[in-house]
Interface confidence: medium
Amino acid sequence: LPAQVAFTPYAPEPGSTCRLREYYDQTAQMCCSKCSPGQHAKVFCTKTSDTVCDSCEDSTYTQLWNWVPECLSCGSRCSSDQVETQACTREQNRICTCRPGWYCALSKQEGCRLCAPLRKCRPGFGVARPGTETSDVVCKPCAPGTFSNTTSSTDICRPHQICNVVAIPGNASMDAVCTSTSPTRSMAPGAVHLPQPVSTRSQHTQPTPEPSTAPSTSFLLPMGPSPPAEGSTGDHHHHHHHHHH
């Protein structure tokens, strides 16, 4: 005969774990249902009744299957120098990133506290290291034989064109001028642009849980020795630490 399917809540066999999308409730000592993303546990299970889930309130979310007593608060509204690249919904947090041409000058775990415009390299200087979401552009003087005639946060130093006959020699901020009508170049003409940094998620990451047999003690849920964590069975919990400079 096929094994009977157990319905939550049920007592697990000794040494076994609860199934996917279930968690072990220490108080009831039963395997109980988790709540789906966008919901939270309104009433915890007992020996005779399963978890009662409820939708997250406005400006709160849960991203994973969970048994948290309250949903997580979405991060602060984005500041004027940021763009909201992901809206706050019942299932996901708001994500703010610095607007194009800017980078994060000061950040904490909560996200970017202050955006700053990317440095522009003036004529005679080119981009040595492009800006990223969290670091500024690094400029360098154009080496002999190269130039940049722009003020830009993306242009690198380009080689002077090679003339048959030079009318005006090039310098760090100006290309060579040829008298010949057919100059040659060691690389294609036109400004060379470095790609703009690609924004990555910078705000409020959720902790991932321990296996359901050992509920985590996430800092998000300061409520006793074994509070519930979000996520599915078998994930590992990432503790967030603030790194001192």
Epitope: S76, S79, G111, H244
Partner: antibody, heavy 120, light 111 residues
Framework: QVQLQQSGAELARPGTSVKLSCKAS????????IDWVKQRTGQGLEWIGE????????YYNEKFKGKATLTADKSSSTAYMQLSSLTSEDSAVYFC?????????????WGQGTSVTVSS | DIVLTQSPASLAVSLGQRATISCRAS??????????MHWYQQIPGQPPKLLIY???NLESGIPARFSGSGARTDFTLTIDPVGAVDVATYYC?????????FGGGTKLEIE
């Protein structure tokens, strides 16, 4: 307008604990940090740490780790600081202050302070 | 930790004159063109009050006689002209990195 209302003065015995509160109003409590600052009589200001109530994340001055524990209750918009294993060195006025996540990066609104006296 | 050294420790200025308070950091508090240095006023028996944020920005509601300047490691708070209501202790504070630190304070008196 932004207001931070702190709990009343505390008189405590050495070795015991006290829990100070700071009730915020006039802004979205979960959007900004609450900082705690210590000031001994006639002395300067010392940063203890801060909490981001939206997530419960805390940042401590190493000097106060193990001494101060910061928590926040979103439902009542109240931040708490528990001081444990009190000694005479903990006798001071403790201020809570708001620090916006964005912009100023400074403590722009302060509570009135809570005086803690540790005496046997 | 970033150490902030204020000078002078106390200062006596005549009404209507200029008061200048200095704050020196043990390392730069600048990042990307921003100086994470702030100035507070504390009147006895009251909590500190933010005057200047990020080196030179005047906090809302603070009189224009208060101004801040400086960059990297050297910062100045100027009160010009000094009024009787300005008798207080003034603190600088950095928020570039944890732990945030304060200067030792400068006590301003009227002579």
């Amino acid at each position: 307008q932004v207001q931070l209302q702190q709990s009343g003065a505390e008189l405590a015995r050495p070795g015991t604990s006290v829990k100070l509160s700071c009730k915020a109003s006039g802004y979205t409590f979960t959007d900004d940090y609450i900082d705690w600052v210590k000031q001994r009589t006639g002395q300067g200001l010392e940063w203890i740490g801060e909490i981001y109530p939206g997530s419960g994340n805390t940042y401590y001055n190493e000097k106060f780790k193990g001494k101060a524990t910061l928590t926040a209750d979103k439902s009542s918009s109240t931040a708490y600081m528990q001081l444990s294993s009190l000694t005479s060195e903990d006798s001071a006025v403790y201020f809570c202050a708001r620090s916006q996540v964005y912009g100023k990066i400074a403590m722009d609104h302060w509570g009135q302070g809570t005086s803690v006296t540790v005496s046997s | 930790d970033i150490v902030l050294t204020q000078s002078p420790a106390s200062l006596a200025v005549s009404l209507g004159q200029r008061a200048t308070i200095s704050c020196r950091a043990s390392e730069s508090v600048d990042n990307s063109g921003n100086s994470f240095m702030h100035w507070y006023q504390q009147i006895p028996g009251q909590p500190p009050k933010l005057l200047i944020y990020r080196a030179s920005n005047l906090e809302s509601g603070i009189p224009a006689r208060f101004s801040g300047s400086g960059a990297r490691t050297d910062f100045t708070l100027t009160i010009d002209p000094v009024g009787a209501v300005d008798v207080a202790t003034y603190y600088c504070q950095q928020s570039k990195e944890d732990p945030y630190t304060f200067g030792g304070g400068t006590k301003l008196e009227i002579e």
